[in-house]
């Protein structure tokens, strides 16, 4: 058993049928010594007397807030939370494994540039009773410091006969250090609380491996005399580093016509200028990426040819 | 150059093969065998190798003021892994395929490190780390993460490199 | 259909040389290891050397000067030879792949059936 | 060496129930975060069986109640329910050093 915060606790269970659980003593606080008793949750059912109540908690009829009164005063509250594990492996019933990039994909973060901010979010199809807390570090053993936000509901969507909630939090690093190679990963831990359940969520990573550009922005056409070729010249993010001379982006440049099916022509380019053929009903994009690592393309911005 | 005495650099001639190290350290990257264990192996392998950290001088104002500090960092990096790179960890079982760009990867980054620091200077470098791996899976694992490492490594000497060409050169 | 054969003498005489030859079918010896397991009868399993896809060799410090594991690629064979045998090498002997390095970190994911190996005079 | 001790010799369970086998390695089996221990399943008159590779992956075609888990020294086979098929001797492998190393087995029965 862990104290999660201030009068919260979290009892760690193997769960599989016949377990035998875990044996808690929950200490009552207050310096009364006599005349004590304990109730779980709404019942006025006396579990107990004395300062100490000691149970064993097998299952979540065992967890709830245990609560100790002395002459119809309330003394102190503990609640005791249950954190499953089954097979050697902690229960992951909260959130849902979003299987991008890889199984067991539970936060998934991003970052638009290397300023050391980045945000996070998450799936769950629990709408109700659903608490969420965020720490984050930089390393585990000699942490440095990141501040995040308060997690927020940042969509909703329907998937079949389910809703789905998208969970989303911000995150800044304290003392961001943009040109540097990172040699410590950020940590970032979620804990989960629905109803009686305890989960916590955890990822690790780079910023440089999150990289995702906001899309190239000014996206202009300018077509060249006596030719079926345009110009098309585009401009960074703002949210992109800078200066750009160091922090630069490669871009892709795309002409795709209306049907899918059609044959897309593609240029790779350094510059924020490319020439094109531009085809009737086609549209041309754009797209960046941090052009001396390999980290996720931006979404296109589009104009259409016409 | 980076002639001692803190003359300047070829800022063109080491763009052009930093961003050719970048290219070569991405290809080389999945070509090294298929891999799981990349997934799982996530405790550190490179604590060891020489990061190029905040006070290491290689932001833009850093390079500005001073840009031996940087230039020597980078320096010891390629070295240490062009050392990496011609050690049993690639060269033992399992066997490169032979085409595998991990060869001119190690030669380009000979050849940046001989532009930095011209015959008869020497900056200190620093040791490899005894990874011993014994298996070959353990080899496979540590070519992937060396190459990872490397790939962040040589994004930072590239942002060096391009941002010096644009502000630095003659 | 991976599949890997054990063959060889069923009988020898102390002082002996043992030979056993593996065949496989269903992969090339060029991707994959193959270990030497043995089992002594009721008793527990022993590894005894292992060749790999490059053609280099491990072999288990106990017993590493009686044995020589070698292979032929284009026939799919790898051989065991195992030089003064002694009684107390009577065991089942099995050839096993080594699982693709990249996902199995040295588990064994195929066995032969195992030849049994007595030594008598 | 690496010396693997699995715990107990043997074990008789209820069908349903469930089996835990323990496998403690002298020294540590992981290189970098894998864990190279390894679990087969043998049964009589066969070769040995994969069932699980590095401490936890399930091999294809095992059936989900076999589980893995530990790290380091320490590891753990569990069959969540066990059937009467999974009668048998389970033995753990390490491959993190040579030699490669077993375990000296665990016979699991039906109480």
């Known amino acids: 058993i862990w104290e999660l915060k201030k009068d919260v606790y979290v009892v760690e269970l193997d769960w599989y049928p016949d377990a035998p659980g875990e044996m808690v003593v929950l200490t009552c606080d207050t310096p009364e010594e006599d005349g004590i008793t304990w109730t779980l949750d709404q019942s006025s059912e006396v579990l107990g007397s004395g300062k100490t109540l000691t149970i064993q908690v097998k299952e979540f009829g065992d967890a709830g807030q245990y609560t100790c009164h002395k002459g119809g005063e309330v003394l102190s509250h503990s609640l005791l939370l249950l954190h499953k594990k089954e097979d050697g492996i902690w229960s992951t019933d909260i959130l849902k494994d979003q299987k991008e990039p890889k199984n067991k994909t539970f936060l998934r973060c991003e970052a638009k540039n290397y300023s050391g901010r980045f945000t996070c979010w998450w799936l769950t199809t629990i709408s109700t009773d659903l608490t969420f807390s965020v720490k984050s570090s930089r390393g585990s053993s000699d942490p440095q410091g990141v501040t995040c936000g308060a997690a927020t509901l940042s969509a909703e969507r329907v998937r079949g006969d389910n809703k789905e909630y998208e969970y989303s939090v911000e995150c800044q690093e304290d003392s961001a250090c943009p040109a540097a190679e990172e040699s410590l990963p950020i940590e970032v831990m979620v804990d989960a609380v629905h109803k009686l359940k305890y989960e916590n969520y955890t990822s690790s990573f780079f910023i440089r491996d999150i990289i995702k550009p906001d899309p190239p922005k000014n996206l202009q056409l300018k077509p060249l005399k006596n030719s079926r070729q345009v110009e098309v010249s585009w401009e960074y993010p703002d949210t992109w580093s800078t200066p750009h001379s160091y922090f630069s982006l490669t871009f892709c440049v795309q002409v795709q016509g209306k049907s899918k099916r059609e044959k897309k022509d593609r240029v790779f380019t350094d510059k924020t200028s490319a020439t094109v053929i531009c085809r009737k009903n086609a549209s041309i994009s754009v797209r960046a990426q941090d052009r001396y690592y390999s980290s996720s393309w931006s979404e296109w911005a589009s104009v259409p040819c016409s | 150059r980076a002639v001692p005495g803190g003359s300047s650099p070829a800022w063109t001639q080491c763009q052009q093969l930093s961003q050719k190290l970048c290219t070569l350290a991405w290809s080389a990257h999945p070509l090294v065998g298929h891999m799981d264990l990349r997934e799982e192996g996530d405790e550190e392998t490179t604590n060891d190798v020489p990061h190029i950290q905040c006070g290491d001088g290689c932001d833009p104002q850093g390079l500005r003021d001073n840009s031996q500090f940087c230039l020597q960092r980078i320096h010891q990096g390629l070295i240490f892994y062009e050392k990496l790179l011609g050690s049993d960890i690639f060269t033992g079982e399992p066997s490169l395929l032979p085409d595998s760009p991990v060869g001119q990867l190690h030669a380009s980054l000979l050849g940046l490190s001989q532009l930095l620091q011209p015959e008869g200077h020497h900056w200190e470098t620093q040791q490899i780390p005894s990874l011993s791996p014994s298996q070959p899976w353990q080899r496979l694992l540590l070519r992937f993460k060396i190459l990872r490492s490397l790939q962040a490594f040589v994004a930072v000497a590239a942002r060096v490199f391009a941002h010096g060409a644009a502000t630095l050169s003659p | 259909q991976v599949t890997l054969k054990e063959s060889g003498p069923v009988l020898v005489k102390p002082t002996e040389t043992l030979t056993l030859t593996c065949t496989v079918s269903?992969?090339?010896?060029?991707?994959?290891?193959i270990s030497w397991v043995r089992q002594p009868p009721g008793k527990g399993l022993e590894w005894l050397g292992v060749i790999w896809t490059g053609g280099g060799t491990n072999y288990n410090s106990g017993i590493k000067s009686r044995l020589t594991i070698s292979k032929d690629n284009s026939k799919s064979q790898v051989v065991l030879t195992m030089t003064n045998m002694d009684p107390v090498d009577t065991a089942r002997y099995y050839c096993?792949?080594?699982?693709?390095?990249?996902?199995?970190?040295?588990?064994?994911?195929?066995w032969g059936q195992g030849t049994t190996v007595t030594v008598s005079s | 060496d690496i010396v693997l001790t699995q715990s107990p010799d043997s074990l008789a369970v209820s069908l349903g129930q469930r089996a835990t086998i323990n496998c403690r390695a002298s020294e540590s089996v992981d290189y970098y975060g894998i864990s190279s221990m390894h679990w087969f399943q043998q049964k009589p008159g066969q070769p040995p069986k994969l069932l699980i590779y590095?401490?936890?992956n399930l091999e294809s075609g095992i059936p989900a109640r076999f589980s893995g888990s530990g790290s380091r020294t320490d590891f753990t086979l569990t069959i969540s329910s066990l059937q009467a098929e999974d009668v048998a001797v389970y033995y753990c492998q390490q491959a993190n050093k040579d030699p490669y190393t077993f375990g000296g087995g665990t016979k699991v029965e039906i109480k």
């Open positions: 269903g992969f090339s010896l060029t991707q994959y290891a």
């Open positions: 590095r401490a936890s």
């Open positions: 096993v792949r080594e699982g693709d390095y990249g996902s199995y970190a040295g588990a064994m994911d195929y």
